[in-house]
């Protein structure tokens, strides 16, 4: 029950996270004009990964997509790539995790297969979240660098007033959405990985052929010991020697001419 809850919660958290990553990627407010020195301005500039916008004091907004691909800063291209990779991995992870959910029955899918799928989707969510966090952080670092550069490039005007030579930009709402969304996706991924441990079968008993004598004498049954890897002991006190012709999981095997010693 706890495993199903952990898996389900991990899925929901990751779903919200990936929706947030998509929202952040599409948002226009990655960087917004810093109004610290100019609180009353006729126009307000803000930019996203795909277009830049200018808003008038009346509320009217005009946006224009970045018409060139080659002329854009390499950092912006890198952030775009990270966010897209994050979305793609997250989407694939969601698809895989739907089939991995314990509460959903698909054919005769074994728990081991569901465990593997849960682990795969968990890893995908973790990488997706890290991509989003990295993308947002790279953009934030770029903003901070530019902000302090434009502050350093201040000059004193004729009236002795300090002026900046370029408009300064600060963190937009998309950055915070991206950080939170990336974090949620990461947490969801970790939860899926934890759930995977509970889904995986604790032990694998391999079927082995039983050998028995024609009389009531004892036959040696190699299947009595679990795979000879040293993993686990015979904790369930199963009989190691058994006169009956049965495999370890008690399925009847019929004697053939090779069975008799």
């Amino acid at each position: 029950m706890a495993v199903t809850a952990c898996q389900g919660l991990g899925f929901v958290v990751s779903l919200i996270g990936i929706a947030g990553i998509i929202a952040a990627t599409c948002m226009d407010q990655w960087s917004t004009q810093d109004l610290y020195n100019n609180p009353v301005t006729a126009v307000f500039n803000y930019q996203g990964l795909w277009r830049s916008c200018v808003r008038e004091s009346s509320g009217f907004t005009e946006c224009r997509g970045y018409f060139t691909l080659l002329g854009l800063p390499a950092m912006l291209q890198a952030v775009r790539a990270l966010m897209i990779v994050g979305i793609v991995l997250g989407a694939i992870g969601l698809l895989v995790s739907i089939f991995a959910l314990k509460c959903i029955r698909i054919g005769s899918m074994e728990d081991s297969a569901k465990a593997n799928m849960t682990l795969t989707s968990g890893i995908m969510f973790i990488v997706s979240g890290l991509c989003a966090i990295a993308g947002v952080s790279v953009f934030a670092n770029m903003l901070v660098t530019n902000f302090w550069m434009s502050t350093a490039n201040m000059y004193t005007g004729m009236g002795g007033m300090v002026q900046t030579v370029q408009t300064r930009y600060t963190f937009g709402a998309a950055l915070f959405v991206g950080w939170v969304a990336g974090g949620l996706t990461l947490i969801g991924g970790v939860m899926m990985c934890i759930a995977c441990r509970g889904l995986a079968p604790e032990e694998t008993n391999y079927k082995a052929v039983s050998y028995h004598a024609s009389g009531h004498s004892v036959a040696y049954k190699p299947g009595g010991f679990k795979a000879s890897t040293g993993f686990g002991s015979n904790t369930k006190n199963k009989k190691i020697y058994d006169g009956g012709a049965r495999t370890e999981d008690e399925v009847q095997s019929y004697p053939s001419k090779h069975d008799y010693v």
């Epitope: 004009q33 126009v43 500039n45 930019q47 830049s52 200018v54 008038e56 009217f60 005009e62 224009r64 970045y66 018409f67 060139t68 002329g71 434009s150 490039n153 002026q163 900046t164 030579v165 370029q166 408009t167």
Partner: nanobody, 123 residues
Framework: QVQLVESGGGLVQAGDSVRLSCAAS????????VAWFRQAPGKEREFVAG????????NYSDSVRGRFTISRDNAKNTVYLQMNSLGPGDTAVYHC????????????????WGQGTQVTVSS
């Protein structure tokens, strides 16, 4: 890359009007926000007016608001600055500037600049 060439400047009387033009070549001007700056002798370059890609949003400095009008004709790849009620304080070299990302009011916001056209207002 876009090249900008200003024209229309000259010597005018105080109170007169003049229209400056800024013709762009090399790229479509509709991909750029454009602005006019001016630089008087011994002074810093100051923002005069700016217009967005389509020209639907405009911005003016307090010193020229109500007297100057910025407009653009993207079909002709040209930006205009209509200057009315000119005074001696408007004497300066007027520069046209373009930037694809923002409509700023600082010189550092613009990547492309014209050589400028001199406007002298005599009293």
């Amino acid at each position: 890359q876009v090249q900008l060439v200003e024209s229309g400047g000259g010597l005018v009387q105080a109170g007169d009007s003049v229209r400056l033009s800024c013709a762009a070549s090399g790229q479509t001007l509709s991909n750029y926000n454009v602005a006019w700056f001016r630089q008087a002798p011994g002074k810093e370059r100051e923002f005069v007016a700016g217009a967005t890609w389509s020209g639907r949003i405009t911005n003016y400095s307090d010193s020229v608001r109500g007297r100057f009008t910025i407009s653009r004709d993207n079909a002709k790849n040209t930006v205009y600055l209509q200057m009315n009620s000119l005074g001696p304080g408007d004497t300066a070299v007027y520069h046209c500037a373009a930037n694809s990302f923002q409509l700023g009011d600082k010189p550092g916001d613009y990547h492309y600049w014209g050589q400028g056209t001199q406007v002298t207002v005599s009293s």
